[in-house]
Each structure stands twice: as structure tokens, then as C-alpha cells.
């Protein structure tokens, strides 16, 4: 906290410029008018102040705007944004995507800080939904952003926003999140032709149901093993050997290397060994020939 002292004669700042780096902290406090600072915040971002001097400038803004900064100031905070607490940021009303981008740029290359997380939360809540432009911006800065949202939060993502999603944005998503995103992606890409559709939908298939996988198996998609291994186990289990063979195409040979891992392991246990043998991969663990398979879940449904 800087002591309140009168500004020395002739030192009153008429504008925010480089000469202010030669002011002591108490002189900045006494000689820089907070309203002037607020209107010329963009200039602060061109002046090489020390961190201590910036603390004084922040203090002046805090005094001027105890209820929270206006967006005209927020947009030009630059480094000062990193000095804000989440409590400070909760007082803000940020509506402009340009403001959001400017602040995310300051933190670029760093992990998502509590300040950034709070800012994004305020921004998205203010907009009411995660629209395409916002999602585009957020995933450009933080590829893992989408997967940091809860399934409930993801439900507010409109299908049109899915076009902004890149495969790497979904790398850390769990099945519950993909369950929400997959139907949106299916809707977003529904008018694309077979091969183009598969390229776009591939990253979302961890949320696909059995019937959609069956449909894909009829389209010569040649799904790679990495994608297959991310499919829901419950969606893979009902697929026949012939369907999996069609789904994977030339990649079917990769099943051998994954036979001890889910979902391949569980799927093998559900297949007739005879059928598995037709693949010629030496997959073992299927239902021996001559055994009858009862689907107990179907039996329960009937009774």
C-alpha cells in the first residue's frame, strides 16, 4: 500500500507515457489520475513498467471501480489481468470476443490459470451458450478446454459449434463427455457424404451407439485401431465378427496386438471361436463350438 502524499509541483501526469517509468511508486499514486489511467489503459501495454509500478496502477483502478472494471478497461489490461484474483474477475461483465482474445493472449503458452478459468466461465455464462466463435477461440488457446467441461455444461454446446472442434481437442475427453458430444456431431455432419463424414465424426465415435457402428461398417470406412480402442465397450460387444471386419477393413489385423485389452478382449469373449477363426489372426478366447449362448438380458426383458 502506497502512502497518500501530495503530487510534487510540475509532476502531475497529463497523459500515460514513457516518462512515468521514472516515477517512484508514491509519485505514481499521487500524480496519475485514475480516470486518465482508465481512458489510456492501452498505452500502459507499451510502457515497460516494473511489477511494483503496475501494482500501484492496479490499486488506482481498484479504487476507481470498486464494483468491477468496465469492459473498455478490461480489454486493455494486458499483464494486469494476471494480477487479478478470481474474485475481481467475477465482478466483470465481459461480452466482447475481442476482449476475451486479448486477455487469453496475455496468458498464452501457460496452463489455464484460475483467472482464465473464471474469465471463460463469466464469458460463456454471459453469452448463454458456447457458440462456434467462442469455442473456436477457446480451443485455439486451450486444446483441452472442451474436455474440461462437465457433461451438463457440454449440453449447452449447439451442434453448429462442433465444426470448430479439432481431433486434438477431444484427446482428454472421457466417455461421458463423448456421449454428449457425439449426437451433436452426428447432427452437425449429417449432410456430408460417406468418406468426408467419417473423417469428421471419427474423433467423436467414443460416444457412438452400436447401431451407428453397424451402419458405418457398411460404408468401407477402414477405421484405425486407435479409434476402435476408444469405442464404448457396450457399443462394440453386439457387433459380429463380419461387422468388425468390415468396420476395420485392412486394419483388422491390428486386433491381434490388442486382444488382451478392452474393448477387444471383451468382444472376443462374446464371439464364436469359429467366427473368430475366419479372420485368420489366431484370436483365442471365443465361445467354443457347440456351446449355446443365452442372452440373459433379453430373457429378463421378456419375463
Amino acid at each position: 500500500e502506497v502512502e497518500k502524499t501530495a503530487c510534487p509541483s510540475g509532476k502531475k501526469a497529463r497523459e500515460i507515457d514513457e516518462s512515468l517509468i521514472f516515477y517512484k511508486k508514491w509519485e505514481l499514486e499521487a500524480c496519475v489520475d485514475a480516470a486518465l489511467l482508465a481512458t489510456q489503459m492501452d498505452r500502459v501495454n507499451a510502457i515497460p513498467f516494473t511489477y511494483e509500478q503496475l501494482d500501484v496502477l492496479k490499486h488506482k483502478l481498484d479504487e476507481l471501480y470498486p464494483q468491477g472494471y468496465p469492459e473498455s478497461v478490461i480489454q486493455h489490461l494486458g499483464y494486469l489481468f494476471l494480477k487479478m484474483s478470481p474474485e475481481d474477475i467475477r465482478k466483470w461483465n465481459v461480452t466482447s470476443l475481442e476482449t476475451l482474445k486479448a486477455l487469453l493472449e496475455v496468458n498464452k503458452g501457460h496452463e489455464m490459470s484460475p483467472q482464465v478459468a473464471t474469465l471463460i466461465d463469466r464469458f460463456v455464462k454471459g453469452r448463454g451458450q458456447l457458440d462456434k466463435d467462442t469455442l473456436d477461440t477457446l480451443t485455439a488457446f486451450y486444446p483441452g478446454y472442451l474436455c474440461s467441461l462437465s457433461p451438463e455444461e457440454l449440453s449447452s454446446v449447439p451442434p453448429s459449434s462442433i465444426w470448430a472442434v479439432r481431433p486434438q481437442d477431444l484427446d482428454t475427453c472421457d466417455p461421458r463427455q463423448l456421449d454428449v458430444l457425439y449426437p451433436k456431431a452426428r447432427l452437425a455432419f449429417q449432410n456430408m457424404n460417406g468418406s468426408e463424414y467419417f473423417v469428421k465424426i471419427q474423433s467423436f465415435l467414443g460416444g457412438a451407439p452400436t447401431e451407428d457402428l453397424k451402419a458405418l461398417s457398411q460404408q468401407n470406412v477402414s477405421m484405425d485401431l486407435a479409434t476402435f480402442m476408444k469405442l464404448r465397450t457396450d457399443a462394440v460387444l453386439p457387433l459380429t465378427v463380419a461387422e468388425v471386419q468390415k468396420l476395420l477393413g485392412p486394419h483388422v489385423e491390428g486386433l491381434k496386438a490388442e486382444e488382451r485389452h478392452r474393448p477387444v478382449r471383451d468382444w472376443i469373449l462374446r464371439q464364436r471361436q469359429d467366427d473368430l477363426d475366419t479372420l485368420g489372426l489366431g484370436l483365442q478366447g471365443g465361445i467354443p463350438n457347440g456351446y449355446l449362448v443365452l442372452d440373459l438380458s433379453m430373457q429378463e426383458a421378456l419375463s
Epitope: N45, A46, L54, G78, V106
Partner: nanobody
Framework: LQLVESGGGLVQPGGSLRLSCAAS????????IGWFRQAPGKEREGVSS????????NYADSVKGRFTVSRDNAKHTVYLQMNSLKPEDTAVYYC??????????MGQGTSVTAP
């Protein structure tokens, strides 16, 4: 973001030193740089500044005519040439920078002694 100062040392009053400020892990080219100093028991004070292009420089009254700030963007370095050093110039010298979007960096300092 980290800046690294070098070139400090012990020098006789009236002597000269050239301090350097370089970036660690990024390039200084689009950063405006300020030089500051802090004498024992005193507040840090501004010494000089230079714009990112090098076209604009400023100096504290106490060093005008003796210190010169410059930059070599090919070497990604900013310099502070200090001539006619006085005992009162004894301090730890720091550089601070500001770049695009208000990104900032500051160094740990280099010590200058002119007893």
C-alpha cells in the same frame, strides 16, 4: 518470461560499463525495454527506456548525457552504456520489458559498484 542482465561489475568512478539485457526462451525484438536500478535500502528507480523499434529513448535526469540505451535486434539484445560513473550509480540494475498484448518480463539484476 525471463530477462537476463549481464555486464555488471566493479569500476572506478569516472569509468565505464556496458550492461546487456537478453531474453531467455523468447525474442526481445518486439519488446519495449526499461532499465531500472535499486541502491541498497532505496526504492527501485527508472533509469532509461527504449521502444521496440529503437526509435524512441528516454532517460532519468540523473543519468542524462552519461548513459545511452540502444538495441541490436539482430542479436536480440538491449544495451545500457554507462559512462562517467559516479558512486551514486552503485546499485543493482534490472531490465523490464513489455511486448505484444502487454506480456511482460523482468530480470534478476546485475550489480554495478562504483565506490
Amino acid at each position: 518470461l525471463q530477462l537476463v542482465e549481464s555486464g555488471g561489475g566493479l569500476v572506478q568512478p569516472g569509468g565505464s560499463l556496458r550492461l546487456s539485457c537478453a531474453a531467455s526462451g523468447f525474442t526481445l525484438d518486439n519488446y519495449a525495454i526499461g532499465w531500472f536500478r535499486q541502491a541498497p535500502g532505496k526504492e527501485r528507480e527508472g533509469v532509461s527506456s527504449i521502444s521496440s523499434s529503437g526509435g524512441s529513448t528516454n532517460y532519468a535526469d540523473s543519468v542524462k548525457g552519461r548513459f545511452t540505451v540502444s538495441r541490436d535486434n539482430a542479436k536480440h539484445t538491449v544495451y545500457l552504456q554507462m559512462n562517467s560513473l559516479k558512486p551514486e550509480d552503485t546499485a543493482v540494475y534490472y531490465c523490464a520489458g513489455v511486448g505484444d498484448y502487454g506480456r511482460r518480463a523482468m530480470g534478476q539484476g546485475t550489480s554495478v559498484t562504483a565506490p
